[in-house]
């Protein structure tokens, strides 16, 4: 049972009748295979559902797919398979939905062997109508929309050609051959890597990075000896092979590849990798894999240029095999990230940062929970969160942690309470303050989703048996009501609600199984009558984010400013509504040394906030010194943390040093140093 189900909870009046009047069943009259669901546009109510069914015949596989459309958030569906001429749609490409509210959809069809190219179905009116287009190539990837112009599409062909369309897939032009990876940048720029000799695999580390800013009319080679590249925020990253050995290093550009700087990060060998964990316009979190098959590495955080990096977290779990990491951006509170570390005894522990990677700590033990068997001390332990890694290990974890930007402070996750992640059946925990404090919300594993910007939380028990009950809470998970949405239980497969957590509709997907057949079925529940009135001023209360000590003058200051939010009172049962905008009021804090990171050539001694000059430069610091650009080697030792808005207070002004003088090494002759390239 859920905490709160047995307590004196303010039950929502007549909720069974209200929900019963707003529960809509739809049975799909085709055999159960796989189903994929996509929302088309924002606040349009349009959902596309593609069901596919494979029948293995003697020599080949016979496939059948059906396309359904809803325009009322899933309450009713219409079979629109005839709009795509009953063609079998390739599910591995999914449904390519256009950005923003463009209303564009591209479906990639299966075509018979020997055909000249593939086939797509295009819609630009929210899937009311489709146009069939035969392609002059066989697509290898899903069509990619330009973020700036949804008429511009790019795709890679099975023969490694880069194809571009300027009229939403009507006409296609091959703009380059021998392409390994292509990505849209800003301003309709395309970045791509090409191989000269054999293939993408054979030329790994010898690829060239190209850029076109005019959809293929002209090109510029912006990098050579490329292993791979990535885009994050305003940064373009490339891992580049070293001249002398098989190692590679990260180079960074903030001007679309015109100029590059070497990043002050360790180089990696053939078996290692770099990974951009998160990036915005201010900074980047970079994972650097440890040598050997350790399953962990180090997180580094960048300065505002993406060049100087501070070590943020050691022994960061990131498996080489499955490429799984638990790194999670808590989108409901600025500066908060959660991830896992692999401790010396090989147990996995959860860590959280509230200041964008400056400091990491364990999660506080929930007040209403006991320490489990993994805890040495039964009174002292932490909450450990199950995320991607646990899911990949097939633990009983149906969902990753959940947070939404418009449900301020709310984080929901599966977890266990002890000294490390436990393989026991997890419970569901909630934080209403962005991860500072936690409460057990539901007993056992559940699927969960946030509706109406946090006004309602919905959950369904994860069970191997058929289910017919949904739970919901109107007070951020403290009290729970249960509603039986059907007399006949279904095998549950998923919860679907419109992305953005503004909707009040939830769709429960599953299938019914009888002696001979099994069919897809969905139940869509509209909670609008539970939240029967619009929220007013009196329904909100003021909350200071990141508050830990009210007696501290700078309480709540993170990255140089504090933010107060209007939060819905837990007792208010009302609609935030689709147009709800988070009301927040920032106030600038005074600067302290904590608002600055140590620039290149400087470090912070343990338990000291001052940046001290490194006596000698070693390892990758020395390499950066030797091969970095000269203007990055002149510093006063401090740089403002990216995104930090503090003013006044401490201003660490001191003598500017030219670190070029320290760029000396026993391995290099003076001539080599003088001729170093910038």
């Amino acid at each position: 049972s859920a905490p709160g189900e047995d307590e004196e909870c303010g039950a929502v009046r007549d909720f069974v009748a209200k929900l019963a009047n707003n529960t809509h069943q739809h049975v799909f009259d085709d055999l159960r295979g796989s189903v994929s669901l996509s929302w088309v546009g924002d606040s349009t109510g349009v959902i596309l559902v593609l069901t596919t069914f494979h029948v293995p015949l003697v020599i080949m596989t016979f496939g059948q797919s059906k396309l359904y459309r809803s325009e009322d958030y899933g309450k009713n569906f219409k079979d629109i398979t005839d709009l795509i001429n009953n063609t079998f749609i390739r599910t591995e490409f999914g449904m390519a939905i256009g950005p923003e509210n463009s209303g564009k959809v591209v479906l990639t069809a299966e075509v018979s062997g020997g055909s000249r190219g593939g086939r797509i179905f295009r819609s630009s009116d929210f899937a009311k109508n489709f146009v069939q287009t035969d392609l002059p190539f066989h697509p290898l990837t899903q069509m990619m929309y330009s973020p700036q112009n949804s008429d511009y599409l790019l795709a890679l062909s099975t023969e490694n050609g880069l194809w571009v369309s300027k009229n939403f897939g009507g006409k296609w032009e091959e703009i380059h051959k021998a392409v390994c990876l292509a990505k849209w940048g800003s301003d309709n720029t395309i970045f791509f890597t090409t191989y000269a000799n054999g293939s993408c695999k054979a030329d790994l580390g010898a690829l060239e990075l190209w850029r076109t800013s005019d959809l293929g009319k002209s090109f510029k080679t912006i990098g050579v000896k490329i292993y791979s590249f990535g885009l994050g925020g305003r940064f373009l990253f490339a891992s580049v092979m070293a001249d002398k050995d098989t190692t590679r290093r990260i180079h960074v550009s903030t001007d679309q590849g015109d100029t590059w700087s070497m990043a002050q990060l360790p180089s990696v060998g053939q078996e290692q990798f770099y990974s951009i964990l998160a990036a915005n316009d201010d900074m980047v979190f970079m994972h650097v894999d440890e040598p050997g098959d350790t399953g962990f590495g180090t997180i580094f955080t960048s300065d505002d240029r993406g060049i100087v990096y501070s070590k943020s977290l050691d022994r960061h779990l990131y498996t080489t095999t499955g490429g799984e990491t638990d790194f999670t951006n808590v989108t409901s509170l600025r500066g908060v990230y959660i991830t896992s570390v692999l401790s010396e005894d090989n147990s996995i522990q959860t860590m959280i940062t509230f200041d964008q990677g400056g400091r990491w700590t364990h999660l506080r033990k929930p007040e209403n929970s006991e320490c489990d068997a993994t805890a040495k001390n039964k009174n002292e332990c932490s909450l450990h969160i199950h995320a991607s890694y646990s899911i990949s290990q097939k633990l009983n974890v149906p969902m990753a942690p959940l947070s939404e930007p418009n449900a301020v402070g709310i984080v929901i996750a599966h977890g266990s309470v002890g000294d490390a992640i436990s393989v026991m059946v997890p419970d569901v925990y909630i934080s209403d303050d962005g991860g500072y404090s936690w409460t057990k919300m539901l007993e056992g594993p559940h699927y969960y989703t946030i509706l109406d910007s946090g006004g309602i939380i919905v959950a369904i028990e994860h069970s191997s048996r058929p289910i017919n009950v949904i739970k919901f809470s109107t007070d951020e998970g403290q009290c729970w009501q249960t509603y039986t949405f059907t007399r006949d239980p279904i095998y549950f497969t998923g919860l679907a609600s419109e992305p953005g957590a503004r909707s009040m509709n939830i769709s429960i997907w599953g299938f019914t199984e009888s002696f001979l057949t099994s069919q897809w079925v969905s139940y869509t529940i509209d909670f609008k009558d539970i939240l029967e009135r619009n929220c007013e001023e009196k329904d909100y209360t003021i909350w200071l984010a990141h508050s830990t000590d009210p007696e501290d003058y700078e309480d709540g200051c993170i990255l140089g400013y504090k933010e107060q939010f209007l939060r819905l009172r837990k007792s208010s049962v009302c609609q935030n509504g689709r147009d709800y905008v988070v009301t927040k009021q920032p106030s600038i804090c005074l600067c302290s040394l904590e608002d600055f990171l140590c620039d290149f050539g400087y470090y912070r001694p343990e338990n000291d906030s001052k940046c001290v000059e490194q006596p000698e430069l070693k390892g990758h610091d020395l390499e950066f010194c030797l091969y970095g650009r000269e203007e990055h080697l002149t510093t006063n030792g401090y740089r403002k943390i990216p995104g930090d808005k503090c003013q006044g207070g401490v201003n660490p002004v001191r003598e500017v040093k030219d670190l070029k003088k320290k760029c000396t090494s026993n391995f290099l002759s003076p001539e080599k140093q003088n001729s170093k390239s910038n």
């Epitope: 209360t541 003021i542 009210p550 003058y553 504090k562 837990k570 009021q585």
Partner: antibody, heavy 124, light 106 residues
Amino acid sequence: QVQLVQSGAEVKKPGSSVKVSCKASGGTFRNYAISWVRQAPGQGLEWMGGIIPIGGWANYAQKFQGRVTITADESTSTAYMELSSLRSEDTAVYYCARQGRKTGYYYYYGMDVWGQGTTVTVSS
Amino acid sequence: DIQMTQSPSTLSASVGDRVTITCRASQSISSWLAWYQQKPGKAPKLLIYKASSLESGVPSRFSGSGSGTEFTLTISSLQPDDFATYYCQQADGHITFGGGTKVEIK
């Protein structure tokens, strides 16, 4: 130790306004909400409204909306409550109180420090 | 606004008695309830916050319980200094107080 010191007693005519001050000392004034509570002779406690000094966010009880204005001056660590259109029923002791705070919520933890009270008498 | 109903309004008890005062909210307020003690001519004093947390410096004979809509304040063994008026206050809506319970000598 935090202290709240209120201004002295007032005698006012009906229809006029009164402004009561509440000065904080010995604590971090800006990080706590200040509430104003009144108590008519022989009656119970009645919350009028509150303010958070950072940002000056004020909120008022429905009953006093439009008639009460609560402000705060961070530089002097002083909160003010002004009540207009006074009537005889407004005769009461007016208290300012600091809202205790354990988390980011300003109003959820009770009022842990109180002023000594200011008697306001409304009489023609 | 949320209404708070306190009972009884007056309670006669002797030193050493166990005293219980109840407070009912017109809708669920979770645990956001405080209890105060007030003596004539003095400002109220916070005893309990968040329904059951004892304010520092308050004797342990005072305890609070409840959540949702029903709450109680208990004085396990009444002392001479405890004869006063007690108020509950909810904090999950615009703040409202209960009508008060006067604990007097029997």
